[in-house]
């Protein structure tokens, strides 16, 4: 009997046309939400005059539909049995799910009054960005739309830049009709255990992002993973939302709609500096900010974000150290709410319900030479916006689950 | 040792223009900005515009916008200065130099504009 | 625009004198003032720069301090060879401008 199914589980999720796996794997029949939570700035005076804390206070949910489209230009290549795709991007908004509209305003940090200031370290360059930060009324802080944030807006100060410069900014910009890849992963056809493993991505086995093994592409997308996942697993999965490769770990047994599935999260040591996680010392980039790799919780990701510097944490900062989040006032982190666990039903390796949540930071820095910014004492790691990346298992495919792969097996 | 050597002195024809070289050693061009100074016969200097080879970033003082042009060709790690629409007024030595705190000078090149 | 106005325009001293050059920006400029020698027929000579910062090679007995929009450009124990033109130069902000100087004369 155990034979029979394990051949048959081997055949199902195999990524090729006709099995189970590939008509999911193509078109993700469960329905992915995105929630945004934005971080208002209560204080945007103080803080660019005085060096105050920063005073967030989060608005959201603001919900998206987001993984509806199929895989594009989906090639398998039968000489080293790997199947191609490219990820399309596309996010419908939701109101019935948000607390607000699109239209909704925010306090933020000007992005790119942050971003520019950083990239041009350059005396002279920071002046010249200083007269035209003034000649276009930008300042430290800035009023948007929600859409505007996300999805883009054409920026006053960069407009002036006399030189090319991308003058649309966006915290996700651009992303409708865009496409992550192109994802090279193993259909399992010769070896079901490396099933939906990640070959190469944009052509390659490394990101040029990280030294060493940090720039290694490991594991799969985290949709699936190979099949008769044993809880002593360490599972890895790479996230190109992160720019790294990271990996989740057995918590509990849960019950998903009849289902028995493993409760895997990220644990707290993967975000730890280096001190504590050896491992994590090629995640440290440079000295400063992490105060000699002593800080935690955060990733600096500007290398892949063109130099903008972007810093990736969990939301509210959970499991970064006290001195990241020492400057911001109105954060509340809480395990519960705020880490990544992915539900993976063992037999097939198929993640049938996760929680994605990461929050997008931007580093502001005193500037002698840009005004906004002369009056700073300090460095900020701002908080511009967490999210909540969901998706449960519906209904009626957990019924043809459990009739087809649980209900076999019991 | 960092040197900055000029192009030699010009004598011009009023509406005309003037190109001015500056070539650089002794140090990484593109590491540091070129800025341009200029100081009529019995003057004090004054400002007229700064490039930074490493970005392309130029900033011109108000009173030449429109008439200077700065440009730096990293191959050859030489900043120019192009004057035009020159006048009596323009006659003054010009100096290359150095970074925010104009830490090393070219030698000058005397432009004279007479008709 | 900041407008840097220098004082005095000329002024005569004896060897081992003192003597001091004031420079008043119309803005706060922190502490982003450099002050330059030029001798007949030479380019200006960088002496010090931002922060009150004594370059390399240039004599002790230069020296300078100030904050915000007053400072002030001191010689101590004058020697013949210091006879010279004296330039600031306020470096915070664009356009970056020249006091209009000040001509030493060594009795």
């Known amino acids: 009997g155990d034979l029979l199914i394990q051949k048959t589980i081997k055949k199902q999720v195999v990524l090729e046309e006709g099995t189970i796996a590939f008509k999911n794997w193509v078109k993700t029949g469960t329905e992915v939400y995105r929630q945004f939570w934005i971080f208002d700035v209560q204080n945007p005076q103080e803080v660019m005059m005085n060096s105050s804390n920063i005073q967030v206070k989060q608005r959201g949910p603001y919900t998206y539909r987001v993984r509806f489209l199929a895989k594009e230009n989906v090639t398998q290549d039968a000489e080293d049995n790997t199947v191609s795709f490219l990820q399309p991007n596309g996010a419908i908004f939701e109101p019935s799910l948000s607390v607000g509209t699109e239209a909704d305003n925010f306090t933020v940090l000007n992005l790119a009054v942050a971003a520019a200031s950083h990239i041009y370290q350059n005396q002279f360059v920071q002046m010249i960005l200083n007269s035209l930060i003034n000649k276009s009324k930008s300042s430290m802080f800035q009023v948007r739309t929600l859409r505007e944030l996300l999805w883009g807006y054409r920026d006053p100060f960069l407009s002036l830049v006399p030189y090319p410069v991308t003058t649309t900014v966006g915290l996700f910009y651009p992303y409708n009709n865009t496409a992550d890849g192109v994802y090279k992963v193993f259909n399992g056809k010769d070896n079901i255990s490396k099933v939906a493993i990640i070959d190469t991505y944009k052509g390659k086995r490394n990101l040029s992002y990280w030294e060493s093994h940090c720039d290694m592409i490991n594991g799969t997308d985290a949709a699936s993973f190979p099949p008769f996942v044993e809880k002593s697993q360490v599972l890895q999965f790479f996230s190109s939302d992160i720019c790294r490769s990271i990996y989740a770990v057995f918590e509990s047994d849960v019950n998903l709609k009849g289902i028995p599935v493993y409760r895997f999260v990220l644990p707290s040591k993967a975000f730890a500096s280096p001190v504590e996680n050896p491992d994590n010392y090629c995640f440290c980039t440079e000295k400063i900010i992490s105060k000699n790799c002593t800080s935690y919780g955060v990733l600096d990701i500007s290398k892949c974000k063109e130099g903008r510097p972007v810093y990736i944490s969990l939301p509210h900062f959970l499991y970064a150290s006290p001195d990241v989040s020492e400057p911001i006032d109105g954060l509340n982190p809480n395990e519960e709410e705020h880490r990544t666990y992915l539900d993976i039903e063992p037999i097939t390796g198929f993640t049938l319900q996760f929680a994605k949540r990461l929050q997008v930071n931007l580093l502001v820095k005193p500037s002698e030479k840009i005004q906004v910014l002369k009056n700073l004492k300090r460095n900020y790691i701002v908080p511009i916006l967490w999210l909540n990346e969901t998706g449960t298992i519906g209904d009626e495919k957990a019924n043809m689950f459990r009739s087809q792969v649980t209900g076999k097996i019991n | 040792q960092v040197q900055l050597v000029q192009s030699g002195a010009e004598v011009k024809k009023p509406g005309s223009s003037v190109k001015v070289s500056c070539k650089a050693s002794g140090y990484r061009f593109s590491d540091y900005e070129m800025q341009w100074v200029r100081q009529a016969p019995g003057q004090g200097l004054e400002w007229m515009g700064g490039i930074d080879p490493e970005t392309g970033g130029i900033a011109y003082a108000q009173k030449f916008q429109g008439r200077v042009t700065l440009t730096a060709d990293k191959s050859t790690s030489t900043a120019y200065m192009e004057l035009s629409s020159l006048r009596s007024e323009d006659t003054a030595v010009y100096y290359c130099?150095?970074?925010?705190?104009?830490?090393?000078w070219g030698q000058g090149t005397l432009v004279t504009v007479s008709s | 625009e900041t407008t840097v106005t220098q004082s005095p325009a000329f002024m005569s001293a004896t060897p081992g004198d003192k003597v001091t050059i004031s420079c008043i920006t119309s803005?706060?400029?922190?502490?982003?003032m450099n002050w330059y020698q030029q001798k007949p027929g030479e380019p200006p000579k960088l002496l010090i720069s931002?922060?009150?910062t004594l370059r390399p090679g240039v004599p002790s007995r230069f020296s300078s301090s100030g904050y915000g929009t007053d400072f002030t450009f001191t010689i101590n124990n004058i020697e013949s060879e210091d006879a010279a033109y004296y330039y600031c130069l306020q470096s915070d902000n664009l356009p970056l401008t020249f006091g209009q100087g000040t001509k030493l004369e060594i009795k």
């Open positions: 130099t150095r970074k925010l705190d104009f830490d090393y």
């Open positions: 803005t706060d400029i922190d502490d982003d």
């Open positions: 931002e922060g009150s």
